[in-house]
Interface confidence: medium
């Protein structure tokens, strides 16, 4: 064909407002003398006389011009049908992009401005090589790689298996029928960390403790447990109607509240980020709530945390987990046993 | 060479319908326009509508909206016009002709359509 | 609609006369304007297109001239098969219309 199909439907042919269009008679060879009519139009818009051969140019188009135009040869064969769409070549899109565990990252996409065209997206992704490394430039091992769009959601794409300490560029072309332009993006994993809230988190009364919760949770399904990729924790905590949070970071996945207000329902919330402090704070979870017992009042064990710290009593063994209720900065972190009084006093102490 | 046949006559009653036939020969049907025109003695030549057979589009004479239905079989080179609800006011030689979008190039000889009780 | 008027309404000339028909547009229409000619019992043929180009396998004596609203058909020197009657018919808006027409007749 004389018209070089421009990415969108058949049929179409594109241009910018304000600007020039030459449209193309698809049904003819190229250079053939043809007549130009608007669809709906009898008049004659361009006769084959004009030396343009299949070819219509419109000076400066704008909205009214968009629709459809009629070509044909000199001796009436039919050339076909044109239709004309008005819009912007592509800006740069903006893109952002997250993790919610370590080896994994996605990114989103959003145009820099409204074509009004058919618009598709080009991602991809490479590691970036340190200085001085001049030799792995066109390694295989540093990509591009291709990210995969998200099939269920559109304007994201992820990158799976990703090295934590490696920095990645990030690709995303948009491209419309008008043209096509770059957004480069240097990501990081541990600066673009930000773990889903943590997930089951329960509230339960203590009882004959009218001023004590017992808060319990779990990691986040989208976090995969390894020694070396440990999360911390955030807890806050309020009595209804109270306008301000308290705020505790716990060790492991719970935490007894000593200074709740007796006989109130209270609301308690969690947030965990990675225990080095990659990235940022998780959103807090969903709400929980919780109301202290009413029963007989309990001697109170000493407080050996000012208020907010575990109780030897409210410690309960992590069966559903064999992460560390505590992290160590040792090479190979042990599971702490909470099932041993000494080993937890000896933490607590 | 270029032929568009079409029947000589019709002789129809008031308030019925007739289709009326005009076969293309020497030529790739699909490429052009096909329009019917409606002649009487005293009102001229009066445009009905084109259709292109290579995708049934038309347009119509608005005044003619109602009157007519232009279709086509390719599988035949044949053009189709179907006149309805007759009055006398209809009786007419109707000439199909090939041509461009808006001209016309190639006649058929016309059909004489009487509408008579 | 466009209104094309045609004048004379009948014209009586000699053959090897000169002749000019003339078409009024009732509104501007550009080059938008073709003429026809129909012998007695015949279909009509495309004569000139676009107010003055020339069809293929048409004499070179018929010639038309015009633009806007007012155009001609001229006839260098008339030959018998000249006389018959000529339609104007403009194309520059739906629905397509034609001139009554005027029919030119031996003297």
């Known amino acids: 064909s004389p018209c070089p199909q421009a990415w969108g439907p058949p049929g179409v042919q594109y241009g910018q407002p304000g600007r020039p269009v030459m449209l193309c008679c698809p049904g003819v060879s190229a250079g053939t003398p043809v007549s130009w009519f608007r669809d709906g139009d009898s008049r004659l818009l361009q006769g084959p006389d004009s030396g343009l051969g299949h070819r219509l140019v419109l000076a400066q188009v704008d909205s009214p011009d968009e629709g459809t135009y009629v070509c044909q040869t000199l001796d009436g064969v039919s050339g076909g049908m044109v239709t004309l769409k008005l819009g912007f070549p592509p800006a740069r899109p903006e893109v952002s992009c997250q993790a919610v565990d370590y080896e994994n990252f996605s990114c989103t996409w959003s145009p820099g401005q409204v074509s009004g065209l058919p618009t598709r997206y080009l991602t991809s992704y490479r590691k970036k090589t340190l200085p001085g490394a001049e030799s792995q430039r066109e390694s295989p091992s540093t990509g591009p790689w291709p990210c995969p769009q998200d099939p269920l959601e559109a304007s994201r794409c992820v990158v799976h298996g990703a090295e934590f300490w490696s920095e990645y560029r990030i690709n995303v072309t948009e491209v419309n029928p008008l043209g096509a332009s770059t957004c480069l993006l240097d990501v990081r994993l541990q600066s673009i960390l930000r773990p889903d809230p943590p997930q089951g988190l329960r509230v339960e009364s203590v009882p004959g403790y009218p001023r004590r919760l017992h808060a319990s949770w779990t990691y986040p399904a989208s976090w995969r447990r390894q020694p070396h990729f440990l999360l911390k924790f955030r807890l806050q905590y309020r009595p209804a109607q109270h306008p301000a949070w308290s705020t505790v970071e716990p060790i492991g996945l719970e935490e007894v509240i000593t200074d709740a207000v007796a006989g109130l329902p209270h609301a308690v919330r969690v947030s965990a980020r990675d225990f080095l402090d990659a990235g940022t704070w998780s959103a807090w979870s969903p709400e929980a709530w919780g109301t202290p017992s009413t029963g007989p009042l309990q001697d109170e064990i000493p407080d050996w945390s000012q208020g907010h710290g575990q109780q030897l009593e409210a410690v309960v063994a992590q069966e559903d987990s064999p992460a560390p209720a505590r992290p160590s900065l040792q090479p190979d972190p042990r599971p702490l046993d909470h099932r041993d009084p000494l080993e937890q006093v000896a933490v607590l102490a | 060479q270029v032929q568009l046949q079409q029947p000589g006559a019709e002789l129809v009653r008031p308030g019925s319908s007739v289709k009326l036939s005009c076969k293309a020969s020497?030529?790739?049907?699909?490429?052009?326009?096909m329009h019917w025109l409606k002649q009487r003695p005293v009102q001229g030549l009066e445009w009905i509508g084109n259709?292109?057979?290579?995708?049934?589009?038309?347009h119509y004479n608005q005044k003619f909206k109602d009157k007519a239905t232009l279709t086509v079989d390719k599988s035949s080179s044949t053009a189709y016009m179907q006149l309805n609800s007759l009055t006398s006011e209809d009786s007419a030689v109707y000439y199909c002709?090939?041509?461009?979008?808006?001209?016309?190039?190639?006649w058929g000889q016309g059909t004489l359509v009487t509408v008579s009780a | 609609d466009i209104v094309l008027t045609q004048s004379p309404a009948t014209l009586s000339l000699s053959p090897g006369e000169r002749a000019t028909l003339s078409c009024r547009a009732s509104q501007s229409i550009s080059n938008n304007l073709h003429w026809y000619q129909q012998k007695s019992h015949e279909a009509p043929r495309l004569l000139i297109k676009y107010a003055s180009q020339s069809i293929s396998g048409i004499p070179a004596r018929f010639s038309g001239s015009g633009s806007g609203t007012d155009f001609t058909l001229s006839f260098s020197s008339l030959e018998t098969e000249d006389f018959a009657v000529y339609f104007c018919?403009?194309?520059?808006?739906?629905?397509?219309?034609f001139g009554q027409g005027t029919k030119l007749e031996i003297k």
């Open positions: 002709a090939r041509g461009d979008y808006v001209l016309f190039t190639y």
């Open positions: 259709i292109g057979p290579s995708d049934s589009k038309t």
């Open positions: 018919q403009q194309s520059y808006s739906w629905p397509l219309t």
């Open positions: 020497g030529y790739t049907f699909t490429n052009y326009w």
